[in-house]
C-alpha cells in the first residue's frame, strides 16, 4: 500500500499546534485512502529545507528567498504549489518588484549612480535584495560591506532599519532610519512617500504599491517605471517593465520522490473544505496564535505549479540574478561596453558539432550550449545557460510567452539590402505523391501524415489548426491513421511512422531522420500519404539538390500540392495553393542580450554568411547539406526587425490567434509553466 | 572523404606532457576547420580546441594556457600538445575535419590519455 502521508515541516510551537490541528481535522473529511497529513518539528526553515532532502519531512512554505535556499545543492528542492492572493477568477501568485521614478525626472536605470533611493526596508525583497543584487556591479568597489557600497553609489537614502551610525548616508533622507511604522518613510507605501514627497528620485516597492497610493489615475499618470533595458514605462505596464517577477509563498518538496501529486491532492482537498470562508472550526489560512503560521494569512487558495517548472524557472532570471549576485558576491572583472560571448543553444549532437566549428571560426565570439529538444533550448535561454537560437514561428510564439524576444529574421529570397528588408513570410503547405490521385485535402482522414515536429509552424501548427477548425477536437492521432510528428508521446499514433532507432524514435531532433522540413518530406516519400512542410521543401530535395541515397533520384513532378478548396496542384504553384502564410524563423534571446546577440550575430554574418561562396573550404554558417542545423539552410541572411520586436508583433495577430486556438491542444509542458508565470 | 586517425595517446602522472597526432588520408589544406574532441567515462563528447584553414585556435576554458592545436598542411596532419596534465583530462580524444558536414555519427578509434600517479 503507497504511504499517503505527507509529512508537514514546522518551524515554531504555534506552527506545530497549527499543523496538529490541521491533521486531525483533516482526518475528519478525508476518506481512510485518502492523503492524510503528519507533523515534523523542526528550529528554522533552513532546518526544514534540510529534513525533506533527508527524506525525513516532505512539504513546507517559504517565500521567494527559501525558495532560492531549498533550490541550491544540495537540497535540490523545488516549487510544487503556490499560494494565490486576490480572486479565484484572478489569481495572484507573483508580485513585481518595480522602481518607480517621477515622471519628468528623465534618467534611466542605467544612471541611477548619485540618485537619491528609497527603500521599504534593509533585507527586504522588493525594497532591497532585489535592486541592490540587480545593481551589485554597478557599486563602487570594496562592495562589502554592502552597506558602504550603496551608500556610495546614491547620493543619499531611505534605507529603514540600516545601521545609522555606520552608513549615516542611508538615512539622510529619513533620520534615524526607524524600523516601523513610526518612520514615515518605512515600508511599501512610506517608500513611495519618500518619492512622492521629493525626498527621492526613485522607489524600489512592488507593482500593488502605487495603486494602493494613489486611486486616482491622473495622479499615478505623474510617475513611471524604470525597465531593465533603460527604457521607461507607464505604472500599469509592471508586467513589461520590472525588475523581477516574485513568488509569494511557495509549498517546496524533493525534485525526485518528491510526492508532489500526493501534496496537490492534500492541499487541493483541505482547500475545499477549510479554505477561505469554509469552515468555522478550522481555518488553513487563519493563525489564532500567531501570524502566517503554515501558510499565510492573506492566501485565498493554491494553485499546482506545473511540473515542468523547476525553482530557477519559478523565481525567474531576474531574481536568482539578484540573490546570487548578493549571495555569491562575484562579478566580471571590470564591467566593460564590450560584449560577452554569446551562448548559442544547439539541438543534440549534429547541431552541436556544427555550433563547435562555429565556436572556433567566430574565434571565442560564439560559445555552444547543447540540449535534447527545442523547449529545452528555451529553458536554457530563460534562465541564463543559453543566450540565443534561431526558431521555428511556433517556438517563437512559446518563446514569446516564457519571456523572450525575437531579435533578427531569417530571410530566404535574395535582394540588394536583405538585412534591412524583414520578409514577409513562406508558404505552409501539404505535400502527397501525384500518384495517390484521389487524396484531397477534404479526405485526409485515416491517411498517413508526416509533420516536421510537434509545435512547429508549417508542419503542425498551421494543418493542425486548420484540421481543428473542422473536427473540434484535439484527437489528431485518431484522425490519421499513423503519422510521424516528433515530439508526440511515444505510444501515440503519431510516432509510428517515425524511423529513430531505440530512444531517438519520434524525438524532436535530428537524432530522429523523419524530422524537420528534409526528414518529414523524407517520412512521405518512403512510407507516408502527406507531408506538412514549407513551399522549398520539395524543390530543396528533388532534382539531385539532396545527394543522400534515399532523395538523389526524387522528381519534383512526382510531387503535388493540396489546396484548401479540395483541389490540387503541381508544387511550383504553391503562391496559389498552400495553407497559411508563416512568419520566418527567428533568433531569440532574452531582453538583457538583445542588443550584444544583434551585434555579434550581423558581425558573424559578414564573415560567414551568403558571401562566402566556398563551403567545402571554409565556414558557412547557413548551410548544412538540407539538414537545417542552427539556420535553415536556404537562409540568406539575418534581417533586422525594426519594429517588429515583440513576438506577438513578429508572428502577426493572425497566427498567434491561430496558435492561440490551438492552445486547447498543446502538449507543450513549457507553455504550461511559462503561462503560469504570466497568464 | 577525409579518413582520419588519433595517435599519441598514453599514460602520464599528472603535471606532464603528451603530444597527439591526427594523420589524415586526403589532403587537409581544403578543410576548413579541425578539431580536437574527448570524453571521459560516463561522460558526452565535449570540444577541446579547434583550428581553422588560416590558423586561428579556440580552446575550451579548461584547457586554455595548457594546451596548444595546430596543423601542418604539409604533412596532412593535426596535433594537440598537452602540457601541465590533470587527472580531468583523462579521457579518449578524437579528431575530426568538420567536412563530412556535422552529421555523420562517424568517429575514429581515438587515442586513449590517462592522467594518473
Known amino acids: 500500500v503507497p504511504d499517503k502521508t505527507v509529512r508537514w515541516c514546522a518551524v515554531s510551537e504555534h506552527e506545530a499546534t497549527k499543523c496538529q490541528s490541521f491533521r486531525d481535522h483533516m482526518k475528519s473529511v478525508i476518506p481512510s485512502d485518502g492523503p492524510s497529513v503528519a507533523c515534523v518539528k523542526k528550529a528554522s526553515y533552513l532546518d526544514c529545507i534540510r529534513a525533506i532532502a533527508a527524506n525525513e519531512a516532505d512539504a513546507v512554505t517559504l517565500d521567494a528567498g527559501l525558495v532560492y535556499d531549498a533550490y541550491l545543492a544540495p537540497n535540490n528542492l523545488k516549487p510544487v504549489v503556490a499560494e494565490f492572493y486576490g480572486s479565484k477568477e484572478d489569481p495572484q501568485t507573483f508580485y513585481y518588484a518595480v522602481a518607480v521614478v517621477k515622471k519628468d525626472s528623465g534618467f534611466q536605470m542605467n544612471q541611477l549612480r548619485g540618485k537619491k533611493s528609497c527603500h521599504t526596508g534593509l533585507g527586504r525583497s522588493a525594497g532591497w535584495n532585489i535592486p541592490i543584487g540587480l545593481l551589485y556591479c554597478d557599486l563602487p568597489e570594496p562592495r562589502k560591506p554592502l552597506e558602504k557600497a550603496v551608500a556610495n553609489f546614491f547620493s543619499g537614502s531611505c534605507a529603514p532599519c540600516a545601521d545609522g551610525t555606520d552608513f549615516p548616508q542611508l538615512c539622510q533622507l529619513c533620520p534615524g532610519c526607524g524600523c516601523s511604522t513610526l518612520n514615515q518613510y518605512f515600508g511599501y507605501s512610506g517608500a513611495f512617500k519618500c518619492l512622492k514627497d521629493g525626498a527621492g528620485d526613485v522607489a524600489f516597492v512592488k507593482h500593488s504599491t502605487i495603486f494602493e497610493n494613489l486611486a486616482n489615475k491622473a495622479d499615478r499618470d505623474q510617475y513611471e517605471l524604470l525597465c531593465l533595458d533603460n527604457t521607461r514605462k507607464p505604472v500599469d505596464e509592471y508586467k513589461d517593465c520590472h525588475l523581477a517577477q516574485v513568488p509569494s509563498h511557495t509549498v517546496v518538496a524533493r525534485s525526485m520522490g518528491g510526492k508532489e501529486d500526493l501534496i496537490w491532492e492534500l492541499l487541493n482537498q483541505a482547500q475545499e473544505h477549510f479554505g477561505k470562508d469554509k469552515s468555522k472550526e478550522f481555518q488553513l489560512f487563519s493563525s489564532p496564535h500567531g501570524k502566517d503560521l503554515l501558510f499565510k494569512d492573506s492566501a485565498h487558495g493554491f494553485l499546482k505549479v506545473p511540473p515542468r517548472m523547476d525553482a530557477k524557472m519559478y523565481l525567474g532570471y531576474e531574481y536568482v540574478t539578484a540573490i546570487r549576485n548578493l549571495r555569491e558576491g562575484t562579478c566580471p572583472e571590470a564591467p566593460t561596453d564590450e560584449c560577452k560571448p554569446v551562448k548559442w543553444c544547439a539541438l543534440s549532437h549534429h547541431e552541436r558539432l556544427k555550433c563547435d566549428e562555429w565556436s572556433v571560426n567566430s574565434v571565442g565570439k560564439i560559445e555552444c550550449v547543447s540540449a535534447e529538444t527545442t523547449e529545452d533550448c528555451i529553458a536554457k535561454i530563460m534562465n541564463g545557460e543559453a543566450d540565443a537560437m534561431s526558431l521555428d514561428g511556433g517556438f517563437v510564439y512559446i518563446a514569446g510567452k516564457c519571456g523572450l524576444v525575437p531579435v533578427l529574421a531569417e530571410n530566404y529570397n535574395k535582394s540588394d539590402n536583405c538585412e534591412d528588408t524583414p520578409e514577409a513570410g513562406y508558404f505552409a503547405i501539404a505535400v502527397v505523391k501525384k500518384s495517390a490521385s484521389d487524396l484531397t485535402w477534404d479526405n485526409l482522414k485515416g491517411k498517413k501524415s508526416c509533420h516536421t515536429a510537434v509545435g512547429r509552424t508549417a508542419g503542425w501548427n498551421i494543418p493542425m489548426g486548420l484540421l481543428y477548425n473542422k473536427i473540434n477536437h484535439c484527437r489528431f492521432d485518431e484522425f490519421f491513421s499513423e503519422g510521424c510528428a516528433p515530439g508526440s508521446k511515444k505510444d501515440s499514433s503519431l510516432c509510428k511512422l517515425c524511423m529513430g532507432s531505440g530512444l531517438n524514435l519520434c524525438e524532436p531532433n535530428n537524432k530522429e531522420g523523419y524530422y524537420g522540413y528534409t526528414g518529414a518530406f523524407r517520412c512521405l516519400v518512403e512510407k507516408g500519404d502527406v507531408a506538412f512542410v514549407k513551399h522549398q521543401t520539395v524543390p530543396q530535395n528533388t532534382g539531385g539538390k539532396n545527394p543522400d541515397p534515399w532523395a538523389k533520384n526524387l522528381n519534383e513532378k512526382d510531387y503535388e500540392l493540396l489546396c484548401l478548396d479540395g483541389t490540387r496542384k503541381p508544387v511550383e504553384e504553391y503562391a496559389n495553393c498552400h495553407l497559411a502564410r508563416a512568419p520566418n524563423h527567428a533568433v531569440v534571446t532574452r531582453k538583457d542580450k538583445e542588443a550584444c546577440v544583434h551585434k555579434i550575430l550581423r558581425q558573424q554574418q559578414h564573415l560567414f554568411g551568403s558571401n562566402v561562396t566556398d563551403c567545402s573550404g571554409n565556414f558557412c554558417l547557413f548551410r548544412s547539406e538540407t539538414k537545417d542545423l542552427l539556420f535553415r539552410d536556404d537562409t540568406v541572411c539575418l534581417a533586422k526587425l525594426h519594429d517588429r520586436n515583440t513576438y506577438e508583433k513578429y508572428l502577426g495577430e493572425e497566427y498567434v490567434k491561430a496558435v492561440g486556438n490551438l492552445r486547447k491542444c498543446s502538449t507543450s509542458s513549457l507553455l504550461e509553466a511559462c503561462t503560469f508565470r504570466r497568464p | 572523404e577525409v579518413q582520419l586517425v588519433e595517435s599519441g595517446g598514453g599514460l602520464v602522472q599528472p603535471g606532464g606532457s603528451l603530444r597527439l597526432s591526427c594523420a589524415a588520408s586526403g589532403s587537409i589544406f581544403s578543410i576548413a576547420t579541425m578539431a580536437w574532441y574527448r570524453q571521459a567515462p560516463g561522460k558526452g563528447l565535449e570540444l577541446v580546441a579547434g583550428i581553422t584553414r588560416s590558423g586561428s585556435t579556440n580552446y575550451r576554458d579548461s584547457v586554455k594556457g595548457r594546451f596548444t592545436i595546430s596543423r601542418d598542411n604539409s604533412k596532412n596532419t593535426m596535433y594537440l600538445q598537452m602540457n601541465s596534465l590533470r587527472a580531468e583530462d583523462t579521457a579518449v580524444y578524437y579528431c575530426?575535419?568538420?567536412?563530412?558536414?556535422?552529421?555523420?555519427?562517424?568517429w575514429g578509434q581515438g587515442t586513449l590519455v590517462t592522467v594518473s600517479s
Open positions: 575530426t575535419d568538420y567536412s563530412s558536414r556535422y552529421y555523420h555519427d562517424y
